[in-house]
């Protein structure tokens, strides 16, 4: 027997869509072989209508697609705008049509519900609003208006014009009688439930001259939209529930087994711990639509997600909802990168950020995830030469090593730097990764003086002590600016005496500034690297002042001014610029963004919590 499995019978009505899932054993060969959907002919052949290799029959043009989900061993055929001509016998299969790897599917499309027996059909999505219109004649204008629901053989009163409301509809139904000019009354039912579906009868008057109108209410559950994203990548759920719920709390939840739908995030401030650091709920538009970005996708993130609106901020009967089925592809194109980087107070970290190597010219960004409210990610630095004011002198984004990876270096670490950071670009929205910076106990490995004062016209020598653990690394000094750190010549002064229990492999490397000018004032970094891969750094601020007495300054660790404490540093900070990553659609539109720093893109940001690898910053 064939190992392919699917629905043996599919029944639908004209105008509807079907989504046919075919299951196959997910062997390596099966995952990558051709998938097809064909129609069986009277003489036994099977004519391909659509295949995974891009073929689409003219009969299916613009109304069908085939999506393979190799990780799950399934492929899905979606067919829209069904007509009775689509009724017939089909096969879904793998490989060549005539081979045995297939499954027979019978599709039957019947005529859609018409206006039989003067019945008006209302087809409305779950949680939405329906207005049932009920015409009447002049002689019944002053008489009682009512709406009944047919339950089994009996009509049950739902609402009438005397003020009665059936308890099942309390708080979500009203009866409106139009002005005298119109012979019409309307019944409006909000927050539609599946149980509201059925046959209704509206009536004006109670005697044999009453006017009656039949209505058939169909309440549709949303068919989940299939979403397929890479492990460690990101997904954006765009949720458009309509302006009628613009002011109602919104939520995204993940269905567990049973009827539970566990809140992932909502606009009331709730967020599931598993998504800490890797989720943003982007502010809603006036029409009530919003989006949720989840980054650093993990295998366990796969499942059904619902977004909805309800005052409780969670799924309730009658919530308008949208549904997605998320598949997480483990054969990911997004490389593994450390999800945790550790550094010590006063030390540094170097974070490697992956990006789509096809987009080497894209603008790179780094932002700090903030959990307050619905989550935001204010930008800290970009590859175009902008650095947030508070981070001047201690943060740099480098295009190295290139070819799909850029580097972010942050030094002068304090406990307040602990948190989640997102790497992103203005290119591929799926390539957003995250890293958590943890501040651990320990001393910085590189030793430099605190802030240093140089004298105009004189020579300044600034030492940097490298422990022996960095003996095989390239050691450098550079001058920081907002586009990077420009390398400067330095001198190896031999072994350092700054380390206890460290042999001759320790090193003292000095930066010499000859004939100091005002332009020499600023931040200087010493650091280590291996090729294009950066390690630890230490920063020194060099101030320049007028000559007091002739001579040169040779700064030692002992003589150097103590680094100002954080409070002093903070007092010099200016107001934070509003550079928050929020709107995931900004870069999706192919138009020039005048200043991405004021309106950067949340959907570009991504957290990779998908692996447990860690990367050390300073000493562990």
């Amino acid at each position: 027997k064939s190992p392919i499995f699917g629905p043996e019978e599919v029944n639908s009505v004209e105008g509807n869509s079907v989504s046919i899932t075919c299951y196959y054993p997910p062997t390596s060969v099966n995952r990558h072989t051709r998938k097809y959907w064909c129609r069986q002919g009277a003489r036994g052949g099977c004519i391909t209508l659509i295949s995974s290799e891009g073929y689409v029959s003219s009969k299916y043009a613009g109304r069908a697609n085939l999506t393979n989900f190799p990780e799950n061993g399934t492929f899905v055929v979606n067919i829209a705008q069904l007509s009775q001509d689509d009724s017939g016998r089909y096969k879904c299969g793998l490989g060549i049509n005539s081979r045995g790897l297939s499954f027979d599917v019978s599709l039957e499309v019947s005529q859609g519900p018409g206006l039989l027996n003067d019945t008006k059909v209302y087809t409305v999505d779950l949680g939405r609003t329906v207005t049932i219109n009920c015409p009447f004649k002049t002689e019944n204008a002053q008489k009682r208006k009512s709406l009944y629901k047919q339950i089994g053989l009996y009509p049950v009163l739902v609402i009438d014009s005397s003020g009665y409301v059936n308890p099942n509809y309390t708080g979500r139904i009203r009866l409106d009688i139009q002005g005298t000019g119109q012979l019409l009354f309307s019944v409006v039912i909000n927050q539609l439930r599946l149980s509201d579906a059925g046959q209704y009868l509206c009536q004006a008057g109670d005697d044999s001259n009453s006017n009656k109108k039949n209505a058939d209410l169909q309440v549709l559950k949303p068919e989940p939209e299939l979403v397929y994203e890479d492990l460690r990548g990101s997904v954006t759920f765009h949720c458009a529930l309509g302006p009628e719920v613009a002011n109602v709390a919104k939520f995204l939840c993940r269905q567990s087994s049973g009827e539970n739908c566990d809140v992932v995030v909502n606009t009331l401030g709730k967020r599931a711990p598993a998504f800490e650091g890797r989720i943003l709920l982007n502010p809603q538009d006036k029409d009530g639509s919003f989006s949720v970005v989840i980054t650093g996708l993990r295998k366990e993130d796969a499942g059904r997600y619902l977004c909805g609106a309800h005052s409780d901020g969670q799924l309730q009967e009658g919530s308008p909802i949208q549904a997605w089925q998320l598949f997480v592809n483990e054969e990911s194109t997004i490389p593994r990168s450390p999800t945790v980087v550790k550094g010590v107070a006063g030390g540094s970290v170097a974070v490697l950020c992956p990006y789509n190597r096809k987009e080497s010219k894209s603008i790179k960004y780094w932002c700090l995830w903030e959990g307050a409210q619905n989550g935001r990610c204010p930008l800290l630095v970009d590859s175009e030469g902008w650095v947030k004011a508070q981070y001047e002198g201690r943060l740099s984004l480098l295009e190295e090593p290139g070819n799909g990876t850029f580097t972010v270096i942050l030094n002068q670490l304090t406990s307040r730097d602990a948190g989640f950071y997102w790497c992103l670009t203005n290119g591929d929205t799926l390539w957003r990764t995250t890293v958590e910076i943890k501040i651990i106990e320990g001393e910085p490995n590189l030793k430099v003086p605190g802030n240093v004062t140089a004298v105009l016209g004189e020579t300044l020598k600034v030492p940097c002590h490298f422990p022996c653990k960095f003996s095989s690394y390239e050691k450098y000094w550079c001058k920081w600016n907002n586009t990077g750190c420009q390398a400067l010549p330095s001198q190896d002064e031999g072994p350092s005496k700054a380390f206890v229990n460290c042999d001759e492999n320790s090193r003292l490397v000095s930066l010499t500034l000859n004939l100091v000018t005002r332009a020499d004032e600023g931040w200087y970094w010493c650091g280590v690297k291996q090729g294009h891969f950066y390690g630890e750094t230490a920063a020194v601020y060099v101030a320049v002042e007028e000559r007091k007495a002739a001579g040169s300054r040779d700064v030692s660790l002992a003589k150097a001014d103590a680094a100002p404490d954080e409070k002093v540093l903070d007092s010099g900070f200016r107001e934070i610029e509003n550079k928050a990553i929020q709107d995931p659609r900004l870069f999706a539109e192919e138009k020039a963004v005048a200043d991405t720093r004021d309106q950067a893109d949340g959907s570009r940001a991504s957290v990779d919590s998908g692996s447990s690898e860690e990367q050390g910053g300073s000493s562990r």
Epitope: F5, P7, E8, E9, V10, N11, S12, V13, N16, S17, V18, S19, I20, Y23, T74, P113, T123, L126, R193, L194, S195, Q218, L220, K221, E223, P224, Q255, S257, G258, E259, G303, R304, E317, Q325
Partner: nanobody
């Protein structure tokens, strides 16, 4: 919670027919599919048939061993699913369980189903 109650089991001769019913009550939102599984003495529970719906579209799935003999159907108004079993064989003897799921996955997988009935015994004598 969703409660499922099976009925219609019994003792029949080989070649006869039976119709099993499964009535769902309680909070049936947002159930997407209901199905039948069976468990013969000393064997594991196995998939028999499932019906899944979305609006006015429905999908029916069957195990190979029941194809052409069993038919699954549902009555939306009554929240009931039926399994019409024709041409019964002695090897169809088992406890038949009704199950419901809110998740969209492989309809054959037991762990996709959150709600289960107590089961109804079907015995086919030769």
């Amino acid at each position: 919670q969703v409660q499922l109650v099976e009925s219609g089991g019994g003792l029949v001769q080989a070649g006869d027919s039976l119709r099993l019913s499964c009535a769902a009550s309680g909070r049936t939102f947002p159930t997407y599919a209901m199905g039948w599984f069976r468990q013969a003495p000393g064997k594991e529970r196995e998939f028999v048939a499932t019906i899944r719906w979305s609006g006015s579209t429905q999908y029916k799935y069957y195990a190979d061993f029941v194809k052409g003999r069993f038919t699954i159907s549902r009555d939306n108004a009554k929240n009931t699913v039926y399994l019409q079993m024709d041409s019964l064989k002695p090897e169809d003897t088992a406890v038949y369980y009704c199950a419901a799921t809110t998740l969209l996955g492989d309809p054959r997988a037991l762990n996709e189903y959150a709600y289960w009935g107590q089961g109804t015994q079907v015995t086919v004598s030769s």
